[in-house]
């Protein structure tokens, strides 16, 4: 089956959610791990990741269609220390499949705002830190 990984971001007030979404077949969930790395150009692994999610096969989901699993990493307040390059990755211990999402970046600006760039088209996000609004 076709397995792919996408990265996205959303804001709720001052919180920034970084989301790694893996699309896979139901039976492929077992043994799959999704993880998010920062500033790891070559050695992004579950061990060096900021957060990881081990997928489990959900017997409650009927059919053999494609399903999605999400890892969400929430930053309560973005600070200059969060500036850097992030990447969503996944791997299967069963099949040996390795997935690497596109690199995306958080840039904290001198005005106290931050931008998230490198996401899918129409997902260049610019956030005003103090007001907590999407501009």
């Amino acid at each position: 089956g076709c397995i792919n990984i996408t990265s996205s971001a959303s804001q709720e007030g001052t919180r920034l959610n970084l989301i790694c979404t893996v699309w896979h077949k139901k039976e492929e969930a077992e043994g799959f791990v999704v993880f998010l790395c920062k500033d790891r150009s070559g050695d992004c692994s579950p061990e060096t990741s900021l957060k990881q999610l081990r997928l489990k096969r959900d017997p409650g989901i009927d059919g053999v269609g494609e399903i999605s699993s999400q890892l969400m990493f929430t930053i309560s307040q973005v600070t200059p220390l969060h500036s850097g390059t992030y990447q969503c990755c996944a791997r299967s211990q069963k099949s040996g499949i390795r997935l690497q999402g596109h690199f995306f970046s958080i840039l904290f600006t001198e005005t106290g705002n931050y931008t998230v760039t490198g996401l899918k088209q129409r997902q260049h996000l610019e956030f005003s830190h103090n007001e907590g609004t999407l501009s």
């Epitope: 007030g13 001052t14 920062k38 500033d39 061990e47 060096t48 990741s49 900021l50 990493f73 929430t74 930053i75 309560s76 307040q77 600070t79 200059p80 220390l81 969060h82 500036s83 850097g84 106290g112 830190h129 103090n130 907590g132």
Partner: antibody, heavy 119, light 107 residues
Framework: EVQLVESGGGLVQPGRSLKLSCAAS????????MAWVRQAPTKGLEWVAS????????YYRDSVKGRFTISRDNSKNTQYLQMDSLRSEDTATYYC????????????WGQGASVTVSS | EIVLTQSPTTTAASPGERVTITCRAS?????MHWYQQKPGASPKPWIY???KLASGVPDRFSGSGSGTSYSLTINNMEAEDAATYYC??????????FGAGTKLEIK
């Protein structure tokens, strides 16, 4: 178990230098931004400096800018604070602390290193 | 720079008493964190993001507030709660600031 162990403190004359070290263990050091927080005798806490996980970005409180330098060696799981042109008001216990990645709280602290600046 | 003012500076409470420590910010902040420090020991994160208890903190503690006014409350004071409590916030560009601390003693 997360452990942060500071060393390098001591008595130093005004205008002199001192370098503090903080040896970290029990977590993936290279993933975390680190900080130094100080506490003058019988006083409150004061943030001194922070460094990004990769070491490329550093931040300081105004009173130490140009005098103190924070750095780290991820291969040695150690962060440092080089303190130059020390003043009597820098006398304090200096704590090494980790930045929680998802929040702005300092979640792990070392036992502290005592620095006394006096002639 | 945002200034955090804690009150009272010192207070004493009897076992079983309800205690409230307040932290006022000179400008609005998004979250407040609280630390507990006992003599000769390092500070410990106690309450983070205004109301979340750190691991191992008894549920007699609670935190609340918004804007410029935040508080830490102990519902039934116990001897082991005697310590100094500090509030802390993050804001750009002043970065990390702490309150001067509230010393809580047991009667």
């Amino acid at each position: 178990e997360v452990q942060l162990v500071e060393s390098g403190g001591g008595l130093v004359q005004p205008g002199r230098s001192l370098k503090l070290s903080c040896a970290a263990s029990g977590f993936t050091f290279s993933n975390y931004a680190m900080a130094w927080v100080r506490q003058a005798p019988t006083k409150g806490l004061e943030w001194v400096a922070s460094i990004s996980s990769g070491g490329g970005d550093t931040y300081y409180r105004d009173s130490v800018k140009g005098r103190f330098t924070i750095s780290r060696d991820n291969s040695k799981n150690t962060q440092y604070l080089q303190m130059d042109s020390l003043r009597s008001e820098d006398t304090a216990t200096y704590y090494c602390a980790t930045h929680n990645y998802e929040s702005t709280v300092f979640d792990y602290w070392g036992q502290g290193a005592s620095v006394t600046v006096s002639s | 720079e945002i200034v955090l003012t804690q009150s009272p500076t010192t207070t004493a409470a009897s076992p079983g008493e309800r205690v409230t420590i307040t932290c006022r910010a000179s400008s609005s902040v998004s979250y407040m964190h609280w630390y507990q420090q006992k003599p000769g020991a390092s500070p410990k994160p106690w309450i983070y993001e205004t109301s979340k208890l750190a691991s191992g903190v008894p549920d007699r503690f609670s935190g609340s507030g918004s804007g410029t006014s935040y508080s830490l409350t102990i519902n039934n004071m116990e001897a082991e709660d005697a310590a100094t409590y500090y509030c802390q916030q993050w804001n750009y560009p002043s970065m990390y600031t702490f309150g001067a601390g509230t010393k809580l003693e047991i009667k």
